[in-house]
């Protein structure tokens, strides 16, 4: 059995997350994950899910009753999602920690917007008419 | 020229993001994007970057001076990053809107944790011994 399972069960007890009513009103993540089979689509969604869990764990990091469980699960996420690659994890953390209300961050983000947009899709690297053809081509091959 | 370029330039003026001092202390996103060539790694990072911009745009959505620019850029992101797929965009938005301080959301998230973890890496779907070999192999290749 994976080490995270026992620790996740411990978290369930702590949060009373085993109660039957928890399943009311659908799932947060599971139904969404079921919608996406393509690896790149899954990564878009899992990126948001992992950042949610990291924020959640941060809020409870000083609670001794679940500290070991949280650390074990975070370690397991680092192995599974970040492939034990600390640079990947660090870059991810940087992105999740930027404050959207900080005026210096806002200015930098807007300053970088054109280059970020240019990289959002592989097709975006060529002229507009060619790109529209490429969108079609990519559509046709999907 | 891509339609978003003119609108991004308009945002630059609005945020004074063309000033020389904006480049001080490195980039927010560009250096991170340069680090990752693999499509799935890029999606992990871009997912966070896109959610940052969406939050930023939300904060300024009522400012008439930049409304058209923001709408054009959001449309462009939807075409490029979400492939004009509204279901993908809707699922993404749901994930970004969950409140990490809501106790019902916390309980649901913990309830779903084991299944989310089980899906974090494709390797997680096979026997544990095989998986640990696969992790070693994948790490070695990165």
């Amino acid at each position: 059995q994976d080490p995270y399972v026992k620790e996740a069960e411990n978290l369930k007890k702590y949060f009373n997350a085993g109660d039957p009513d928890v399943a009311d009103n659908g799932t947060l993540f599971l139904d969404i994950l079921r919608n996406w089979k393509e690896e790149s689509d899954r990564k878009i969604m899992q990126s948001q899910i992992v950042s949610f869990y990291f924020k959640l764990f941060k809020n409870f990091k000083d609670d001794q009753r679940i500290q070991k469980s949280v650390e074990t699960i975070k370690e397991d996420i680092n192995v599974k999602f970040f492939n034990s690659n600390k640079k990947k994890r660090d870059d991810f953390e940087k992105l999740t920690n930027y404050s959207v209300t900080d005026s210096n961050v806002q200015r930098k983000a807007v300053h970088e917007l054109i280059q970020v947009m240019a990289e959002l899709s592989p097709a975006a690297k060529i002229g507009k008419r060619k790109r529209s053809q490429m969108f079609r081509g990519r559509r046709a091959s999907q | 020229q891509d339609p978003y370029v003119k609108e991004a330039e308009n945002l630059k003026k609005y945020f004074n993001a063309g000033d020389p001092d904006v480049a001080d202390n490195g980039t927010l996103f560009l250096d991170i994007l340069r680090n990752w060539k693999e499509e799935s790694d890029r999606k992990i990072m871009q997912s966070q970057i896109v959610s940052f911009y969406f939050k930023l745009f939300k904060n300024f959505k009522d400012d008439q001076r930049i409304q058209k620019s923001v709408e054009t850029i959001k449309e462009d992101i939807n075409v490029k990053f979400f492939n004009s797929n509204k279901k993908k965009r809707d699922d993404f938005e749901k994930l970004t809107n969950y409140s990490v301080t809501d106790s019902n959301v916390q309980r649901k998230a913990v309830h779903e944790l084991i299944q989310v973890m089980a899906e974090l890496s494709p390797a997680a779907k096979i026997g544990k011994r095989k998986r640990s070999q696969m992790f070693r192999g994948r790490r070695a290749s990165q």
Partner: antibody, heavy 124, light 111 residues
Amino acid sequence: EVQLVESGGGLVKPGDSLTVSCVASGFTFSNYFIHWVRQAPGKGLEWVATISGRTKYMFYSDSLRGRFTVSRDNAQNSVYLHMSSLRGEDTALYYCVRGYDHSDSNSAADLLHWGRGTLVTVSS
Amino acid sequence: NFMLTQPLSVSGYPGKTIVISCVRSSGSVASHYVQWFQQRPGSAPAMVIYEDSHRPSGIPDRFSGSVDASSNSASLTISGLKTEDEADYFCQSYYGNNQVLFGGGTKLTVL
């Protein structure tokens, strides 16, 4: 009230060109994607092309690529479909249909509002 | 090649329930929204279900839509069948980047 009105259909000969138009009203036109969908007599619906709102990206059916061109004039609330090298099998009722507002996550449904169509007949 | 396959025809008696299926040939049905349209002779298509299971205003709750990932298909269910429901019904979805796909259509006959 959302309205889409197509015009410009008619009888043309094989090999000819024709441009059909669509004028929209009742909504912020530049925010919405617009689709062209056609229906041959007694047949099903076939998607032809789409043009995005402010960015004006063009998307085409694989089978029609190269012969058809979609464009729009946001100042005139108008969309155009230019058809060249027309064939008998292009004979159809051409519908203009409102798409999503992709700048708004709470956009009204795609393909909710349809025009009445304009009939294009290709025959010698 | 991407296809949405519907039965050519379906029939039912007034007051009964009918189901029209729409099977996606490749790609996951769950990865794109599905819409359903009703078309009566001489009229433009009118949406009866959007985004898998939602009804536009004015569409009665006798009409419902669902998606089943296991069979990679969507379904339109009409309960309490009425004579005015007699029409052609088309499912619609997408593939790739904004490429729109329609099913071949199903003729509903109310007996």
